[in-house]
């Protein structure tokens, strides 16, 4: 009986130009994790294979860093990064578990812009 569940960071937001950590955690199962895929809508971002380690898709190499753990760090965020992200845990013997995260990338706050200017 497969009792595993995926816990994710859920709906998260971050500022343009900043970075964010996408995290999932597989619990309530003793299944062995053989590989974790990170996907964004219709693109594969990265793979963490238990034997082979991390592989970052070439188109994301400059902006994606592996970890912490089985998570993924997205850097230099743009508004176009807004959307759904998926952590896909391939396990033995349970099968494949999928978690969803929605990321919203916001324009930098007015307060932050304002702090850059000196008022005479």
């Amino acid at each position: 009986m497969m009792t595993g569940t995926i816990e994710t960071t859920g709906n998260i937001s971050a500022e343009k130009g900043g970075s964010i950590i996408l995290q999932c955690h597989l619990s309530s199962t003793t299944a062995q994790v053989t590989q974790v895929n990170w996907e964004q809508q219709d693109q594969l971002l990265a793979i963490c294979n238990a034997d082979l380690g991390w592989h970052i898709s070439p188109s994301f190499k400059d902006r994606v860093a592996p970890g912490p753990g089985l998570g993924l760090t997205l850097q230099s965020l743009t508004v176009n990064d807004t959307g759904e992200y998926f952590c896909i845990y391939h396990t033995y013997p349970d099968g494949t578990y999928t978690g969803r995260i929605f990321l919203e990338v916001l324009e930098s706050s007015v307060a932050e812009h304002g702090a850059r200017f000196q008022i005479p």
Epitope: M2, G4, E39, Q43, I88, P93, G95, T96, T98
Partner: nanobody
Framework: QIQLVESGGGSVQAGGSLRLSCATS????????MGWFRQAPGKEREGVAA??????????YVADSAKGRFTVSQDNAKNTVYLQMNSLKPEDTAMYYC??????????????????WGQGTQVTVSS
């Protein structure tokens, strides 16, 4: 609403082959979890195979009773899942069902709880 329609069943001699098809519609999840199950007369329904598909590729899971004989595959362009059955035995005689589930609700495997079911297609293997 997800709809599943199986085809390809029939009668075959032991050692023969059949390919079952499952045409799917209304499946809107970005990842796909599809399964094949069978139920022989007077027996409980059992999982035969499952396939998980995403942009990162496909993973297939086949029950021990079908390993080395049955393969599951998917044609994304046709929204169709297949069960290729080779070296059929009389004990493979059963009604075969295609099933689908949300990929976000537990694991995808032939042992998982599936939500959507087709009407089934009969497979009869004679000795």
């Amino acid at each position: 609403q997800i709809q599943l329609v199986e085809s390809g069943g029939g009668s075959v001699q032991a050692g023969g082959s059949l390919r079952l098809s499952c045409a799917t519609s209304g499946y809107t999840y970005r990842q796909k979890c599809m399964g094949w199950f069978r139920q022989a007369p007077g027996k409980e329904r059992e999982g035969v195979a499952a396939i998980y598909t995403s942009v990162g590729g496909s993973r297939t899971y086949v029950a021990d009773s079908a390993k080395g004989r049955f393969t599951v595959s998917q044609d994304n362009a046709k929204n169709t899942v297949y069960l290729q059955m080779n070296s059929l035995k009389p004990e493979d005689t059963a009604m075969y069902y295609c099933a689908a589930k949300s990929p976000y609700d537990g694991a995808c495997s032939y042992e998982a709880d599936f939500t959507y079911w087709g009407q089934g297609t009969q497979v009869t293997v004679s000795s």
